[in-house]
Interface confidence: low
């Protein structure tokens, strides 16, 4: 299987009843506190506002949250934990008319409500410490 | 595979504390997360909090400010410590283990069979 540069970053358009699907691994142990980061950017730029920024602390926390302006808004933690240490996983993000509904393994696990048009959104980026085997968006 | 075993519980005085114990046994007990749940009569298993193998702690809200979960894997056990007990709080509580940080009851690998906690005013 082969895998896809990380960062990786593409165009995309979206609308309400795409999903973003991502497959991959963590690179190292948790115990060593890799990340994973998934960015919505409101332009091919990675300075821009980011409409969803999602972030795995793996075996601690989940973090979410929107730039606006160059400023970072209310973020939302949960500390659900679906990730298993070592184990490959599915991400899928769903746009919802409402929120994006973020799904770990087929369950849903995570919500955050729209603060920047969807419409608005150009591309994402997928980071950190992470092997990338898949990336793709249905629309 | 883990098995476990609650105790601790018992009949006690509304403002009092407890503390439960999570007795484990199986050579890898200190990879899997820990968690304490309950059951009131007539009411839906609910989580109460959990220690993942690493030891970071979390409580759920009915019981935060109330609530110190531990682990000692040099024992293979799990405690809960619950200050300031209200009759509310009365329930069966059930210890399990995950291989995942998820405060779900369908997400749990392995179950207790519950200690019985009677709060009363």
């Known amino acids: 299987m082969s895998l896809l540069s990380v960062p990786h970053t593409e165009s995309v358009s979206l609308s309400t009843g795409s999903t973003v699907t991502i497959e991959a691994r963590p690179l190292v142990c948790f115990f060593n506190e890799p990340h994973l980061q998934v960015d919505f950017h409101t332009e091919m730029k990675e300075d821009s506002d980011i409409a969803f920024h999602f972030q795995v602390y793996f075996g601690n926390r989940v973090v979410m949250n929107s730039r606006e302006y160059r400023t970072w808004k209310e973020e939302v933690e949960s500390k659900n934990m679906p990730f298993q240490d070592g184990q490959e996983f599915e991400l899928r993000i769903l746009v919802l008319e409402d929120k994006y509904q973020v799904m770990v393994n087929g369950q849903a696990y995570y919500n955050f409500n729209h603060r920047i048009p969807v419409s608005s959104v150009k591309m994402v980026q997928v980071w950190r410490d992470i092997s990338l085997t898949k990336f793709n968006v249905s629309n | 595979q883990v098995q476990v075993q609650e105790s601790g519980g018992g009949l006690v005085q509304a403002g009092n504390s407890l503390r439960l114990s999570c007795a484990a046994s199986?050579?890898?007990?200190?990879?899997?997360?820990m968690m304490w749940f309950r059951q009131a009569p007539g009411k839906e298993r609910e989580f109460v909090a959990a220690i993942a193998w690493r030891g970071g702690t979390y409580c759920a809200n009915s019981v935060k400010g109330r609530c110190t979960i531990s682990r000692d894997n040099a024992k293979d056990t799990v405690y809960l410590q619950m200050n300031s007990l209200k009759p509310e709080d009365t329930a069966v509580y059930f210890c399990?283990?995950?291989?995942?940080?998820?405060?779900?009851?369908?997400?749990?690998?392995?179950w207790g069979k519950g200690t019985l906690v009677t709060v009363s005013s």
């Open positions: 199986g050579r890898t007990f200190s990879s899997y997360h």
């Open positions: 399990a283990a995950s291989l995942r940080y998820v405060f779900d009851p369908s997400a749990m690998d392995y």
